[in-house]
Every structure is written in C-alpha cells, then in structure tokens.
C-alpha cells in the first residue's frame, strides 16, 4: 500500500511531538464578550508540537511530504500538527431575537495528526 | 456567528500565503520504484505558504488559534497550510498476484487552507 | 461549601404576585448562571428561565413571558424570580439551581431547597 | 420544543437488581443530555452530565449512554438509597426540557 507506517513513539522526546494541549480562554481573549454569554471561560483543546518524519501522519499525502521535506526542504514544509476530530461544544449567545444555544461542532480540538 | 470572516487576501505579498503549488516528484523520490510502474513521475500539488490572521481558516477552532497565537505566541501555534480536499490519482503497481489499477483519494491536495 | 437559600413558603391570592429569593455562598456569584424550575404538586419538572448573573441577560420559557421577571443582585449574591398574576395551576414548589457550563456542555449542580407557592382564593 | 420521551414511567426492582431507564429526546440533541434523581420532598441531585458524564461524588453504579435521540440510565446494582423519581433534561436548545420521570419502586 501507499502508507508506510506512521510512527507513534516521538524521536524528539517526551511532549515535543504533535499532541493535545488545553489551552485556557476567557470570552475576552477571543474577542467574543460582546455576544457570548457562557461558558465565561473556555478550556480550549488545540493541536501543538513537531511533526517529525512519519510521526502521526494523517494519510498519504503526509507520508509524501514527510519524505519531500527530507529531499527539499526549501521547497516542501514539514507537515504540521493539525485536529484531526473534533469535540462539540454548545454556547449560549446573543441573536436577533434574544438568547439562544447553539452548538458548535468545530470548536475544540479531540485528537491531533500531522498533515 | 463563531466566524469572523476568513481573510482570503494575502498581506504578506504574492505567492507568500498558504496556496496550492505543484511539486514533480519521481518514484525514486518517493521511494516507491519497487511497487509502482507508472506514472513514472509525478506531478504532486501540496499546499505551501503562510498563514497570516485569519487567512483562509478552516473553521472556527483555526480562527480561535489564530487569535490566540497572537496572544500567546509562545504556548499557540499559528494556523497552518494544509489541504482542505485532495484529487484522486491512479496508480499502476505491483501486487502479490500480478499488477493492478487502484485508485488512491489522499494522495494529490486540490485545495488548501489554514488549520 | 456551595449552597444555594431560597425564601420561605408563600400563599397568595389569585392575580397577585410573589417574588422569591435564593441567596448564593460557597462560591463567586457572578461566575455562574441561576435558572429557576418548578414543580407543581404531584407533577414533573417544568424550566422556567435561566439569568445571567453577570450580564441580566435573561431567557424565559415561552408559556411565562410577560408574567415572569428573573433579576439578580451581585453585592448580595442573590437571585430573585417575581411571578405575577398568579393562576391556581401556578402553584408549586420553585427551585433555584447553579448553572455550570463549560467544553463539556451544560448542567445544574447546585439546587436551592425549594420555596412552595401556594395560590389560592 | 424538544420532547423528552422517558420510559418506563415507573419501575419496581429489588435490592441489588440492574435497572435501566430510557429517554428519547424529539430531534437530535448531540450529547447534551444530563439525569437528575429526586427523592420527595426534596431538590433535583444531577447524577450524570453530557449523557455519560459522571458528576463528582455521585457513585460508580450509576452510568449513561447515548448520542443524537436514545440515552439510557443505568443502575448497575440498586441500593436502598436508589429509590426515587430519575429526570432526564436535554439542554441542547431553549427552552430547556425535562422528560416525564421514572419512578424507581420497591418491588
């Protein structure tokens, strides 16, 4: 097949590699005070770390870039750390026509590959 | 809404944004000239670039880590350029039983943006 | 500890109003919302409303719009629902209760003891 | 609105049986879906949040399940202290709405 198989063991050492982080943010921070009511702070989960050579690579695609980026590096990016699911979250804002909740299903990051 | 509204103009300059370029690869680059017999080369679109605040997001979370990053660009990676749809490609290779066709769907970028 | 105190029993007339009070401690008011449920005699659990206890912002079911107004008062960490023209089938046991959201959704953790409004001529 | 459906309306176990009770929810509510226990006389006790969630200091025994219009609660082994009305709440959209109860009876 296409895909050699994507490393999951990080050869940079412990948290250095494309992984899960919360990240805290307050309505403030991301600029949505003025028309979302709650949650008041968010804990927000995001993909971050190095995509090293076939670590986590999200399909074929990432396995060639992998490898083009080890030949070419001026011209191929590395792959990077990206979601690759996410987990839905519902707010309560402001609309037209008073409160509503709503559900945001692209929101807060559940898992991580390197695309 | 969650979304501001994705920026699709680059202020970096020309060419220097998250876009489509092709790359020309050949089997040996790829490390795949013992399996498949043709295309000999190929010609491989990634997605390459920058991604400045708010260009081509992906979606809300992209947004969100875009404004953080400018809060903490320390703890929060920017957003970065990689393929919102991918163009299938045919390859023709080897197998345990003679050659066959078969059609790979992640392996060509058709389109970018800023995850 | 979190608690939530709700005024004592009422008995009120048809038409008249009453208004009930569930004082917060154990916790920063202003960081989380109030809602109000009743439950009438023998019956389930209606939602009434729910108040933002840092902005007002209010959002109330649509069978009590114009007779219901939910307020809160921050220097006192206390929430008040008022009910007016009060029907008989308005009687009932009114709960306050602690609204907690956050990524992982929406739930009501704290409830205060109930406050029992009985209408009748 | 959003109807919540619960089923059974009430159910007799003994000591120590496995008991589980469903709610069916109109349209689809993701997981935004909690359970509450009432005793009489007294305030709603949540048990479980985000339909599987289990809320701290609430035991082990109790779990939840389901996604989009089927949840279930489930009891793995009643306890004397387990008889009681159980409410299932979406809070997916306003208004916010309880199901009818499950009365959990000695048999």
């Known amino acids: 097949s296409a895909h050699a198989h994507p490393r999951d063991s990080c050869p940079l050492g412990p948290g250095r590699c494309c992984h899960l982080e919360t990240v805290q943010a307050t309505l403030e921070d991301l600029g949505w005070s003025d028309w979302v009511l709650s949650p008041r702070q968010l804990q927000l989960s995001m993909c971050v770390g190095e995509c090293p050579h076939l670590y986590r690579s999200a399909n074929t695609h990432a396995q060639i870039k992998a490898r083009l980026h080890g030949l070419q590096p001026d011209k191929v990016p590395a792959p990077c750390c990206v979601p690759s699911s996410y987990t839905p979250v519902v707010l309560m804002h402001r609309t037209d026509s008073g409160v509503s909740l709503q559900t945001y299903d692209d929101l807060v990051a559940r898992g991580c590959h390197c695309a | 809404s969650a979304h501001a509204h994705p920026r699709d103009s680059c202020p970096l300059g020309p060419g220097r944004c998250c876009h489509l370029e092709t790359v020309q690869a050949t089997l040996e680059d790829l490390g795949w000239s013992d399996w498949v017999l043709s295309p000999r080369q190929l010609q491989l679109s990634m997605c390459v670039g920058e991604c400045p605040h708010l260009y081509r997001s992906a979606n809300t979370h992209a947004q969100i880590k875009a404004r953080l990053h400018g809060l903490q660009p320390d703890k929060v990676p920017a957003p970065c350029c990689v393929p919102s749809s991918y163009t299938p490609v045919v390859l023709m290779h080897r197998t345990d039983s003679g050659v066959s066709l078969q059609t790979y769907d992640d392996l060509v970028a058709r389109g970018c943006h800023c995850a | 500890q979190v608690q939530l105190v709700q005024s004592g029993a009422e008995v009120k007339k048809p038409g008249a109003s009453v208004k009930v009070s569930c004082k917060a401690s154990g916790y920063t008011f202003a960081s989380y919302d109030i809602i109000w449920v009743r439950q009438a005699p023998g019956q389930g659990l209606e939602w009434m409303g729910w108040?933002?206890?840092?902005?007002?912002?209010?959002v109330y079911a649509q069978k009590l719009q114009g007779r219901v107004t939910m307020t809160t008062d921050t220097s006192t960490s206390t929430a008040y629902m008022e009910l007016r023209s009060l029907r008989s089938d308005d009687t009932a046991v009114y709960y306050c209760?602690?609204?907690?959201?956050?990524?992982?959704?929406?739930?009501?953790?704290?409830w205060g003891q109930g406050t029992l409004v009985t209408v009748s001529s | 609105d959003i109807q919540m459906t619960q089923s059974p309306s009430s159910v007799s176990a003994s000591v120590g049986d496995r008991v589980t009770i469903t709610c069916r929810a109109s349209?689809?509510?993701?997981?935004?879906l909690a359970w509450y226990q009432q005793k009489p006389g007294k305030a709603p006790k949540l048990l479980i949040y985000a339909a599987s969630s289990l809320q701290s200091g609430v035991p082990s025994r109790f779990s939840g399940s389901g996604s989009g219009t089927d949840f279930t609660l489930t009891i793995s082994s009643l306890q004397p202290e387990d008889f009681a009305t159980y409410y299932c709440?979406?809070?997916?959209?306003?208004?916010?709405?309880f199901g009818g109860g499950t009365k959990v009876e000695i048999k």
């Open positions: 349209q689809g509510i993701d997981s935004w």
């Open positions: 108040i933002s206890a840092l902005s007002g912002d209010t």
């Open positions: 209760a602690r609204t907690r959201h956050d990524t992982s959704g929406i739930r009501f953790d704290y």
């Open positions: 709440q979406q809070v997916h959209s306003f208004p916010i709405t």
